[in-house]
């Protein structure tokens, strides 16, 4: 299986909400001993590999933000913990999964990693990730709403607040 990022860069004004999105696709083993976890964490542009370092998002770890199920089922976190931090992660039946961040501040700027982990027999893990950058801007240079820049082309797209 693979993970694709729809957008590689999100530029947002302070105070706005944004939804970062990834897509999980490819052959999926729906065996009873296989579980998929989808989650998010912050990272930095590593010298060796992007997303190799992991840090919490607004003090929440990847385990606080994860969705887990077998195959391509829909799921979402409505945990009080995440919502108290202005965060919500969700996924649909088509392999899309996202994290919504509310009331952005400059401190939210940085590299975000989406991750899919396949676990067999509750032991070994196989993982694939995607990366995207969030730039939160303030002042006269900030856009009026979030602008998302596609991963594969230079065309930008205005995205509505979540």
């Amino acid at each position: 299986f693979k993970v694709a990022t729809l957008y590689s860069l999100y530029v947002c004004p302070e105070g706005q909400n944004v939804t970062l999105t990834c897509r999980f696709f490819g052959p999926v083993d729906k065996g009873h001993d296989v579980t998929f976890y989808k989650t998010w964490y912050r990272s930095s542009r590593g010298e060796v590999q992007t997303c190799s370092e992991r840090r919490p998002i607004r003090n929440l770890t990847f385990q606080d933000l994860h969705l887990h199920h077998g195959g391509h089922q829909a799921a979402n976190t409505s945990h009080d913990l995440a919502q108290r931090h202005g965060l919500e992660s969700a996924s649909d039946h088509h392999g899309n999964f996202s994290i919504t961040m509310r009331n952005l501040t400059l401190l939210d700027s940085g590299l975000y990693c989406c991750l899919v982990v396949e676990i067999r027999h509750h032991h070994s893990e196989h993982r694939v990730h995607g990366a995207m950058e969030l730039q939160v801007q303030t002042g006269k240079d900030a856009p009026s709403s979030c602008v998302a820049y596609p991963s594969s082309s230079q065309e930008s797209e205005n995205i509505t607040a979540a």
């Epitope: 770890t61 385990q63 676990i119 027999h121 070994s124």
Partner: antibody, heavy 121, light 112 residues
Framework: QVQLVQSGAEVKKPGASVKVSCKAS????????INWVRQAPGQGLEWIAR????????YYNEKFKDRATLTVDKSTSTAYMELSSLRSEDTAVYYC??????????????WGQGTTVTVSS | NIMMTQSPATLSVSPGERATLSCKSS????????????LAWYQQKPGQAPRLLIY???TRESGVPDRFSGSGSGTEFTLTISSLQSEDFAVYYC????????FGGGTKVEIK
Amino acid sequence: QVQLVQSGAEVKKPGASVKVSCKASGYSFTDYYINWVRQAPGQGLEWIARIFPGSGNAYYNEKFKDRATLTVDKSTSTAYMELSSLRSEDTAVYYCARDDSFYGYWYFDVWGQGTTVTVSS
Amino acid sequence: NIMMTQSPATLSVSPGERATLSCKSSQSVLYSSNQKNYLAWYQQKPGQAPRLLIYWASTRESGVPDRFSGSGSGTEFTLTISSLQSEDFAVYYCHQYLSSYTFGGGTKVEIK
């Protein structure tokens, strides 16, 4: 740089308990598992247990589940392993080690310097 | 539990020579989903903690000299040190992380 620094050597009597600490620095402590591994004199490595500091959830080798207790103090980025009902065969060097897994198992990329625990009457 | 067996227990080698260390697992540590072998090698010198050398059976950890190489798949693995330096005399452990964690008994590489 990423570092794990352990507490000093301990000498204990049989039946007592020992609590070893492992202080992490240079990375986000809450987001990586901490494992405990021991090595008896002249012997190989034996995995005891691990803990995810973000949640405090711990996972134990069956052999140690009744005697080992793992805890963390997130405010000081410190992990602890307490081993109770000590016997002479628990004499060993105890290591903490970080692993890079998310939900499964992974290799150990960073190790503490080790804490020698001697159990003797 | 997956059992790990290392051989020989002790290997006597002269500096500059090649050392070949063996590790066998009681069941395959190859994961079908990604075709990776969940096996690592560590080096341990007297009075020191183990140090990660190789993971995924053949990937060198950052900073590890290229005279160290890992090979093998499934249940049989080899760590090769192409030309032994004085600092390479140590004990080497293999470690499977496919299903919980188990280590081999170690191979001591000593000066001949």
